[in-house]
Interface confidence: low
């Protein structure tokens, strides 16, 4: 169980990292990102990077560009695998980044966030099946 | 409880039509993809079609194809198939079932059944 | 559409035996298979998924192993309320397909 457990802590390290600039999305480069919506079962992990791959963009304006390129450094970084993210299912072919309908920073970060609760809710769901991850 | 209850079946003529519904409990529907199986009497599984989450993939087998129609309704919690041109072959018990989520393979939750009888 | 073959197709056998079920794939399917058991007028119950991954909740008498072209799904020691039919499944591609089932009879 260590590989899951490990992956749980990433997920919801991310969902912090998100709230966290959340904060600060008046500082964010007003531009208007990819920000994949009601995702498709199975393709989890193809909107996962479709987010990671986003230009977000901090505005260089005053105190908060470090604590703001940090955060968003934090959030490119590759999560621990899994069965589940190693093998997407190949039998489907998920729409790629730029078939998503692009919002701005606000909106973009706040899809991000349902992402993450959707994954970490679908993790526990088959962690309680008896799913065997690592 | 997690639960999945069919309805809709009964008896019908060849050529006559059929809507079976499912519906879905104590799980996050709008997650999930699901699936039709059937069961002719005395015969093996068959699965007839699949639809993801958001009804974006849909998948039937030759058999059903251009006959039957699957649909789900997520704020409903309801899964539907709509089955023309009803043939005698078709005669089977209909499964609704929950295909397990996130690159895991199975289908981990199935209802009751419901019979479909096509016969003149 | 790719074709599951389950063998035997009928097997007698007693309280306390092992007893192993094949699964071979008419081409590879990686691990994505499962294996369900059915009894009369039941609907079927999963047992195994990601083709060696034992369901929660399923006695660990039961085990599941393979990848590519062939399983196998084992009972260590069957008991009374193991005897019934079982199938394996793919989703490797669609159609899903379904093997024809392996009927346990007690002998």
């Known amino acids: 169980m260590q590989g899951q457990d490990r992956h749980m802590i990433r997920m919801r390290q991310l969902i912090d990292i998100v709230d966290q600039l959340k904060n600060y999305v008046n500082d964010l480069v007003p531009e208007f990102l990819p920000a994949p919506e009601d995702v498709e079962t199975n393709c989890e992990w193809s909107a996962f990077s479709c987010f990671q791959k986003a230009q977000l963009k901090s505005a260089n304006t005053g105190n908060n560009e470090r604590i703001i390129n940090v955060s968003i450094k934090k959030l490119k970084r590759k999560p621990p695998s899994t069965n589940a993210g190693r093998r997407q299912k190949h039998r489907l072919t998920c729409p790629s980044c730029d078939s998503y309908e692009k919002k701005p920073p606000k909106e973009f970060l706040e899809r991000f966030k349902s992402l993450l609760q959707k994954m970490i809710h679908q993790h526990l769901s088959s962690r309680t099946h008896g799913s065997e991850d690592s | 409880e997690v639960q999945l209850v069919e309805s809709g079946g009964g008896l019908v003529k060849p050529g006559g039509s059929l809507r079976l519904s499912c519906a879905a409990s104590g799980f996050i529907f709008s997650s999930y993809s699901m699936n039709w199986v059937r069961q002719a009497p005395g015969k093996g599984l068959e699965w007839v079609s699949s639809i993801t989450s958001g009804s974006y993939y849909i998948h039937y087998a030759d058999s059903v194809r251009g006959r039957f129609t699957i649909s789900r309704d997520n704020a409903k919690n309801s899964l539907y198939l709509q089955m023309n041109s009803l043939r005698a072959e078709d005669t089977a018990v209909y499964y609704c079932?929950?295909?397990?989520?996130?690159?895991?393979?199975?289908?981990?939750?199935w209802g009751q059944g419901t019979t479909v009888t096509v016969s003149s | 559409a790719i074709q599951l073959t389950q063998s035997p197709s009928s097997l007698s056998a007693s309280v306390g035996d092992r007893v192993t079920i094949t699964c071979r794939a008419s081409?590879?399917?990686?691990?994505?298979l499962a294996w369900y058991q059915q009894k009369p007028g039941k609907a079927p119950k999963i047992l195994i998924h990601d083709a060696s991954s034992l369901e929660s909740g399923v006695p660990s008498r039961f085990s599941g192993s393979g990848s590519g072209t062939d399983f196998t799904l084992t009972i260590s020691s069957l008991q009374p309320e193991d005897f019934a039919t079982y199938y394996c499944q793919q989703f490797n591609s669609y159609p899903y397909t379904f093997g024809q089932g392996t009927k346990l009879e007690i002998k």
């Open positions: 081409q590879d399917i990686d691990s994505a």
């Open positions: 079932v929950r295909e397990r989520g996130w690159g895991y393979y199975g289908m981990d939750v």
